[in-house]
Interface confidence: medium
């Protein structure tokens, strides 16, 4: 049954990433493991998330042994830095090769770091927010995604990726406003159920 | 990892200039914001200068250094560069540079994750 639903999930990740695409899907994913690793760094997030991505496109496109060599080797590498990953993959770590891949994928959200800064200083108080969205815009909507999405292990990842596009819509208005302070400044009010 | 390698350290007299460089290798440079930190023999280490992830108009300077050192970055060339104008001895030490993804500016070595090993520059009177 375990691997009748693990299967049924694997179909599920390569229609999505055939349907919405790897810019979707590695969205999806920043989400997903931010939500899941909340005390790794972005950059930790972002490593995981374009190693994850190559490892869908090959198992979805049939690269079977090329999908089941990186498989392994991002499960090696999540493991041998799991202490800037996450304190729940011991158990998961210490299962053989063909059990660990499975084991990474379910496991548990890890705890919260505590002290975490309010996402508004970052997103939407400083003076930086159009500067740092032009100048990279996926990678400045990833982290506020990442930011987001470790806040709220409760939301779906569905709700995030709709707060993230709402963010981006918000940005590409305001930023072409003549006070773009001004007009993004209430944006986080939008997200308030 | 992200490596972190500091160059450009030096002996040079008091009110002339050095320009340090830190490039970064390993992982992507735009994530991070970079720090310049500092210590003197038989002192903490302090903080000298900030400059934010992507933009990089964002910048933060320890009050003994404003107005004399300015921090910059290249995203393209994965580097960062302290410029050091009217040194003191004072600013003689062992001047260190860091990356964090914590927070897109800091001034608080707690948020660096990834530290090089350091340059000295030594101003002599």
């Known amino acids: 049954d375990e691997g009748k639903a693990s299967s049924a999930k694997q179909r599920l990740k390569c229609a999505s990433l055939q349907k919405f695409g790897e810019r979707a899907f590695k969205a999806w994913a920043v989400a997903r493991l931010s939500q899941r690793f909340p005390k790794a760094e972005f950059a930790e997030v972002s490593k995981l998330v374009t190693d994850l991505t190559k490892v869908h496109t090959e198992c979805c496109h049939g690269d079977l042994l090329e999908c089941a060599d990186d498989r392994a080797d991002l499960a090696k590498y999540i493991c041998e830095n799991q202490d800037s990953i996450s304190s729940k993959l011991k158990e998961c770590c210490e299962k053989p090769l063909l059990e660990k891949s499975h084991c990474i994928a379910e496991v548990e959200n890890d705890e919260m770091p505590a002290d975490l800064p309010s996402l508004a200083a970052d997103f939407v108080e400083s003076k930086d927010v159009c500067k740092n969205y032009a100048e990279a815009k996926d990678v400045f909507l990833g982290m506020f995604l990442y930011e987001y999405a470790r806040r709220h292990p409760d939301y779906s990842v569905v709700l995030l990726l709709r707060l993230a596009k709402t963010y981006e819509t918000t940005l590409e208005k305001c930023c072409a406003a003549a006070d773009p302070h001004e007009c993004y400044a209430k944006v986080f009010d939008e997200f308030k159920p | 990892q992200l490596q972190v390698v500091e160059s450009g350290g030096g002996l040079v007299q008091a009110g002339g200039s050095l320009r340090l460089s830190c490039t970064t290798s390993g992982r992507a440079f735009i994530g991070y914001a970079m720090g310049w930190f500092r210590q003197a023999p038989g002192k903490e280490r302090e903080f000298v200068a900030a400059i934010s992830w992507f933009a990089g108009d964002t910048t933060d300077y320890a009050n003994s250094v404003k107005g004399r050192f300015t921090i910059s970055r290249d995203n393209a060339k994965n580097t960062v560069y302290l410029q050091m104008n009217s040194l003191k001895p004072e600013d003689t030490a062992v001047y260190v540079c860091?990356?964090?993804?914590?927070?897109?500016?800091?001034?608080?070595?707690?948020?660096?994750?990834?530290w090089g090993q350091g340059t000295q520059v030594t101003v002599s009177s």
């Open positions: 860091a990356a964090s993804s914590a927070r897109p500016l800091s001034s608080r070595s707690d948020e660096y994750h990834y």
